[in-house]
């Protein structure tokens, strides 16, 4: 069977009937490149205009304007808010009520597109093998990303957080075409990874989705991650306005110049630093979300009752600080370097600052306690990568599933550990899984390209794509379509339950209290220590093109610019584990 | 300027297809999708389906599937809708109507024709 | 399917006077449109994207609102006024409010 063209809300759209077998039979229905809205620089998304005749929905639209890798150059385009749709087919009749999985991408809020990274046509978000193998529609799309995305004066001149509407965008987009498709509109599931796991825990807080999202999945990001909220906004517009030659004194002066000025200038006039610098690298992740008064009307801890009747899998790599701690400290990959004390305080230091020196100390002297009897490199490196996981991903989101399960009704809660070693042959051998390891495993790579991958890659594939579409279809991970291989208990407070995913899933693969100790500390020992503040007038961003990343505001948690009021308010707010 | 013609009114009875045209002229008929819409006596508006003159592509409601079919004939710049296995409950004007611009509003109607269904 | 519902079903109205009729979406929509319907004669477009006026419509008709709650406002009624008015929600599957039945007082 096969959809043809489908009438959508903005006219008729044509995708690919994508036969799986040579023998006929089940196919896939593929529709790249349909527009969900339109957008002017730093603007909230409009819905768009529609077409006649019918849009042929044949290939990935390119992705948001942004930096290169080099971030010497741009690529995309402005014009860039499309999505993909991928909707399985069995021989006979076509699909009907469908789950819906909505794809959001990570990339620090910098980088990424909907279609993700390719080599050779085999693109990383290809939804065909999550659609085709657990049976149901999945939906990438793109979002503005960077400045274009996320510069703000923290006032109602450049309020911020237009990435996340575009992001809302897409899904009330699904919510009201998706039924066309042959999937349900009220079994929507969103999953994203890093920032888009971020972003995923941010549109379930947010109250602009209510009734339109069923279940969540946030793979190593949260909203209550260190890096996932801005609270000096205003610092970094002007950075970026002085780069461009637009005034600085008036937000609103700036705003509206700001908006004229060339999209590829505003974003090439911001450099995420890549060598070390004095403060840990997400520090200078500059253009992310912000609590803006309106989409995110307050902290994220106070809006968890918004997520009361959403279901949610979070999880972390074991390892997904071991991206941060390379760039933070690098002789961490290096056998010929050492990591030596002094690296690991100034990298504790950095990130707790708000607690000033006994916040400093109190975590080192917890984190090197196995240094006396183990004071080996190996030891140390891990104990580095350990603590940028524990601060970046693992504390955030055990207090995020925490509070799922605290203001949940309806809800279920789930909690996994990714623990596949990473594939890299460059790593160390104690390595285990790196930042973005798991993306290769959901989307079915092991399948798609079977010869770069092993036999045991396929289980673990298999597996997490079986948990990942039977909640989509049921809010239990354990029940729908496809086979687990054991049963994936939900998350308590009382004893934090949690899947570790390996290449062998068993019962025992169900386990507790992950980094007990660990989290005991954040959440209370450091909690306690009094709040130190610093003082944000002597921060000077350098006035050259260099590649030098200003100073990060050292109290950047402390501060919070209140919407809609302008930005010289500001509000103390308690500090969340530190940051 | 645009206009809409439909064909008169027709009689039928239960059981039986009806096929109503609605030829367009006064703008190229390939560029805009073709709405059909019917209104019961004293009734409100009810959505039937949608036709691309271009390409032929088609839309229906769910309660319409199986039962409605749309054509067009771009030589004679006219679409036609058959509905078949008629009932009593499926006396109405049927208007057709052209999109406006883009993803619009319906901007332009014909004058409708009244189908009666009746043993 | 998304529901529409208009209020009020009918109203009475005399000439001069300003009329509010309302549109309410089971869920949020983005494009609503309204139009007017005289007896025996094919609907009009009256507004389209919830507050757009076609060349041709007097402008003491006027369109607002956004996501799930729009109104339609006549300023001053002039006697051609009186007719029946139609929310209508643009998906991909369509559909209409039952109908503002506007009478003479």
């Known amino acids: 069977a096969k959809l043809g063209a489908v009438y959508t809300e903005g006219g008729f759209v044509e995708g690919v009937n994508k036969k799986l077998s040579l023998l006929g039979g089940d196919s896939v229905d593929i529709f790249k490149g349909i527009p969900f809205a339109t957008a002017k620089t730093l603007e909230n998304p409009q819905r768009h205009p529609g077409w006649q005749g019918t849009l042929k929905a044949t290939n990935f639209k390119k992705r948001c304007l942004q930096a290169t890798i080099t971030q010497d150059n741009t690529y995309g385009q402005e014009d860039c808010l499309y999505l993909n749709i991928w909707v399985p087919q069995g021989r006979k009749q076509v699909s009907h009520n469908l789950p819906v999985m909505v794809w959001i991408y990570g990339g620090a809020f910098l980088m990424g597109s909907g279609q993700g990274a390719n080599f050779l046509k085999n693109y990383l978000y290809d939804g065909e093998e999550i659609a085709t193998r657990g049976n149901v529609i999945v939906v990438t799309f793109n979002y503005r990303v960077g400045p274009l995305g996320f510069l703000s004066t923290g006032d109602a001149n450049l309020p911020g957080n237009f990435g996340l509407r575009d992001q809302h965008m897409a899904i009330a987009w699904v919510k009201r075409n998706i039924a066309a498709f042959g999937g349900d509109p009220d079994n929507i599931t969103i999953f994203g990874e890093s920032a888009g796991a971020a972003s995923v825990s941010l549109q379930t807080l947010s109250p602009y989705n209510k009734g339109l999202i069923r279940r969540a999945i946030s793979q190593s990001g949260m909203a209550l991650s260190p890096w996932a909220i801005q609270k000096n906004p205003l610092f970094w517009a002007k950075t970026i306005a002085k780069k461009v030659g637009c005034p600085t004194e008036d937000t609103g002066k700036m705003a509206a110049c700001l908006k004229i000025t060339d999209p590829r200038a505003l974003t090439l006039a911001y450099k995420l630093p890549v060598k070390k610098q004095e403060y840990p690298v997400v520090h200078y992740l500059a253009f992310i979300p912000v609590i803006d008064g309106d989409f995110i009307p307050d902290d994220p801890i106070n809006l968890y009752n918004n997520t009361a009747d959403i279901d949610y899998i979070a999880g972390i790599n074991n390892m997904d600080g071991h991206l941060f701690a390379t760039i933070d400290v690098p002789a961490v990959d290096k056998t010929k370097q050492t990591v030596t004390e002094e690296d690991f305080y100034r990298l504790v230091s950095g990130h707790t600052v708000a607690k000033g020196l006994k916040g400093a100390q109190a975590t080192f002297d917890i984190y090197t306690e196995s240094w006396a009897q183990d004071p080996s490199q190996e030891n140390m490196k891990k104990t580095v990568v350990a603590f940028e996981t524990d601060v970046l991903f693992l504390i955030p989101t055990e207090i995020a599933l925490a509070q799922h399960k605290a203001h949940a009704k309806s809800a279920k809660t789930y909690s996994y550990l990714f623990s596949h070693p990473s594939r890299m042959p460059i790593y160390p051998k104690w390595m285990g899984a790196d930042h973005a390891d798991d993306l290769q495993y959901v989307f079915g790579k092991p399948f798609a390209t079977p010869l770069g991958y092993r036999p045991q890659d396929r289980a673990v594939s298999k597996a997490m794509i079986a948990y990942w579409t039977n909640f989509a279809r049921s809010g239990d991970p354990n029940m729908g379509n496809s086979p687990v291989p054991t049963h994936w208990y939900p998350y308590t407070l009382e004893n934090g339950n949690y899947l570790d995913i390996t290449k062998t899933i068993t019962s025992a693969s169900m386990k507790e209290h992950l980094r007990e100790k660990f989290l005991k500390f954040w959440a209370v020992t450091f909690e306690v220590l009094p709040t130190v503040t610093g003082d944000q007038d002597t921060l000077t961003p350098p006035e050259d093109d260099s590649e030098v990343a200003p100073d990060p505001p050292s109290d950047d948690s402390q501060v919070v610019p209140v919407p809609p009021t302008d930005d010289s308010v500001e509000a103390q707010m308690p500090a969340t584990i530190g940051f | 300027q645009v206009q809409l013609v439909q064909s008169g009114a027709e009689v039928k009875k239960p059981g039986a297809s009806v096929k109503v045209s609605c030829k367009a002229s006064g703008y190229t008929f390939t560029s805009y999708n073709m709405h059909w819409v019917r209104q019961a006596p004293g009734q409100g508006l009810e959505w039937i389906g949608v036709?691309?003159?271009?390409?032929?592509?088609?839309s229906y409601a769910q309660k319409f599937k199986g039962r409605v079919t749309m054509t067009r004939d771009t030589s004679t710049s006219t679409v036609y809708m058959e509905l078949s296995s008629l009932r009593s409950e499926d006396t109405a004007v049927y208007y057709c109507?052209?999109?406006?611009?883009?993803?619009?509003?319906?901007?332009?109607w014909g004058q409708g024709t009244l189908v009666t269904v009746s043993s | 399917d998304i529901q529409m519902t208009q209020s009020p079903s009918s109203l009475s109205a005399s000439v001069g006077d300003r009329v509010t009729i309302t549109c309410s979406a089971s869920?949020?929509?983005?494009?609503l449109n309204w139009y007017q319907q005289k007896p025996g004669k094919a609907p009009k477009l009256l507004i389209y994207d919830a507050s757009s006026l076609p060349s041709g419509v007097p402008s003491r008709f006027s369109g607002s609102g956004s996501g799930t709650d729009f109104t339609l406002t006549i300023s001053s009624l002039q006697p051609e006024d009186f007719a029946t008015y139609y929310c209508h929600q643009r998906s991909s599957s369509p559909t209409f409010g039952q109908g503002t039945k506007l009478e003479i007082k």
């Open positions: 109507a052209r999109d406006y611009y883009g993803s619009s509003p319906l901007g332009y």
């Open positions: 036709i691309n003159p271009g390409d032929g592509a088609t």
């Open positions: 869920q949020s929509i983005s494009y």
